[in-house]
Amino acid sequence: IVGGTNSSWGEWPWQVSLQVKLTAQRHLCGGSLIGHQWVLTAAHCFDGLPLQDVWRIYSGILNLSDITKDTPFSQIKEIIIHQNYKVSEGNHDIALIKLQAPLNYTEFQKPICLPSKGDTSTIYTNCWVTGWGFSKEKGEIQNILQKVNIPLVTNEECQKRYQDYKITQRMVCAGYKEGGKDACKGDSGGPLVCKHNGMWRLVGITSWGEGCARREQPGVYTKVAEYMDWILEKTQSSDGKAQMQSPA
């Protein structure tokens, strides 16, 4: 996160760290807890690393430097990458992770509510992006979970800034005209959440941007509302019944 500040314990209890253990262990992506056994993240996090057993998912943590060999983590039972995601295109950048064992909810580890299907009418004015990613383009993973308040921008405005790419209705953009605040490398897959009527909802999944926090280059996020049918289909067919946090 560029231009952010430290988060507090329990402030973003749905935020998880997706880490890979090969020879060393490192944080690669963020994710959002959406049910006892389900994490929503970005498909591109798994490019070149599709093997379930190399991944460790840490939930209920604030500081990555607190992780030791004794820190509990979740393992992956199944990675479900959207069927239309292609490494060569970058659309449909969304994936579900089914955990091997369900998580108990606590003050520091609980799910984020999902938006309604095709939610286009809600005007979100209080949106935040969180993650342990770089604090500048040539930076490093941060120890303490960072947060930053970023306004949504219209898809029309976003398309003007990214004429080389098609900004689809299944994407949502956020950023300041002058730059300075944004997600960055290592924040991929993490949440863009917005508070509406006193409730936090998962509006976007951190996907891509041109650099980080550059002027007139907003961050691009996978629009969760556009994938509600897919999320429900995959979680229900795997579970027998859904255990998602739907909006009230």
Epitope: D47, E89, G90, S188, W208
Partner: antibody, heavy 125, light 108 residues
Framework: EVQLLESGGGLVQPGGSLRLSCAAS????????MTWVRQAPGKGLEWVSY????????IYADSVKGRFTISRDNSKNTLYLQMNSLRAEDTAVYYC??????????????????WGQGTLVTVSS | DIQMTQSPGTLSLSPGERATLSCRTS???????LAWYQQTPGQAPRLLIY???SRATGIPDRFSGTGYGTDFTLTISRLEPEDYGTYYC?????????FGQGTRVEIK
């Protein structure tokens, strides 16, 4: 399976014209930037031109600007390179390639993930 | 234009040895737009690495890429017989997109 098949190469005199084609299959052609790259005999690779998915945006190397025109027909899944005012230094194997634009570490990427087998253009009197 | 300079021009190594190929650029290149290709005689180039460090589909893990800014490296940890050929770096950060002149890896 992604396939790119170039055709239209051959021997042409200096000042002459040639039209290369690249037939694409195995992917949604209209979603991708496409590019031409050439390689003179015994030399390295030289980028020639690219075209946007819709065909509305084209860019050329200075060495071919004003003489070559890249175009595409998405209904036929075919990429073209119209080469006019050919010179001896245009002699090369011409490759068409698909330009992938995925996402890595929260940024877009750009690279040539599939290439055709090439077609040889010889400009000589 | 961004010039790409590869070194060495030729690398003579035995199977099993480590190959380190360098690519320097005349201006800053966003590493997401830096790729490496392999070409063997009579064949079209083949993508090895994209985004400076991501291996393309089907590329063995003995190939790795690193670098940032103006200095990029392709490493082949243990040369196999099929690895001999010419390697090119390429940037598509700014037009005109440009290739390095190539490094030829030959059998010692």
């Amino acid at each position: 399976e992604v396939q790119l098949l170039e055709s239209g190469g051959g021997l042409v005199q200096p000042g002459g014209s040639l039209r290369l084609s690249c037939a694409a299959s195995g992917f949604t052609f209209s979603h991708y930037l496409m590019t031409w790259v050439r390689q003179a005999p015994g030399k390295g690779l030289e980028w020639v031109s690219y075209i946007s998915p819709s065909g509305g945006h084209t860019i050329y190397a200075d060495s071919v600007k004003g003489r070559f025109t890249i175009s595409r027909d998405n209904s036929k899944n075919t990429l073209y390179l119209q080469m006019n005012s050919l010179r001896a230094e245009d002699t090369a194997v011409y490759y068409c390639a698909r330009v992938a634009r995925g996402i890595a570490a929260r940024s877009r990427t750009r690279y040539f993930d599939y290439w055709g087998q090439g077609t040889l253009v010889t400009v000589s009197s | 234009d961004i010039q790409m300079t590869q070194s060495p021009g030729t690398l003579s190594l035995s199977p099993g040895e480590r190959a380190t190929l360098s690519c320097r650029t005349s201006q800053f290149v966003n590493s997401n737009y830096l790729a490496w290709y392999q070409q063997t005689p009579g064949q079209a180039p083949r993508l090895l690495i994209y985004g400076a460090s991501s291996r393309a589909t089907g590329i063995p893990d003995r190939f790795s890429g690193t670098g940032y800014g103006t200095d990029f490296t392709l490493t082949i940890s243990r040369l196999e017989p099929e690895d001999y050929g010419t390697y090119y770096c390429q940037q598509s950060s700014r037009t005109p997109w440009t290739f390095g002149q190539g490094t030829r890896v030959e059998i010692k």
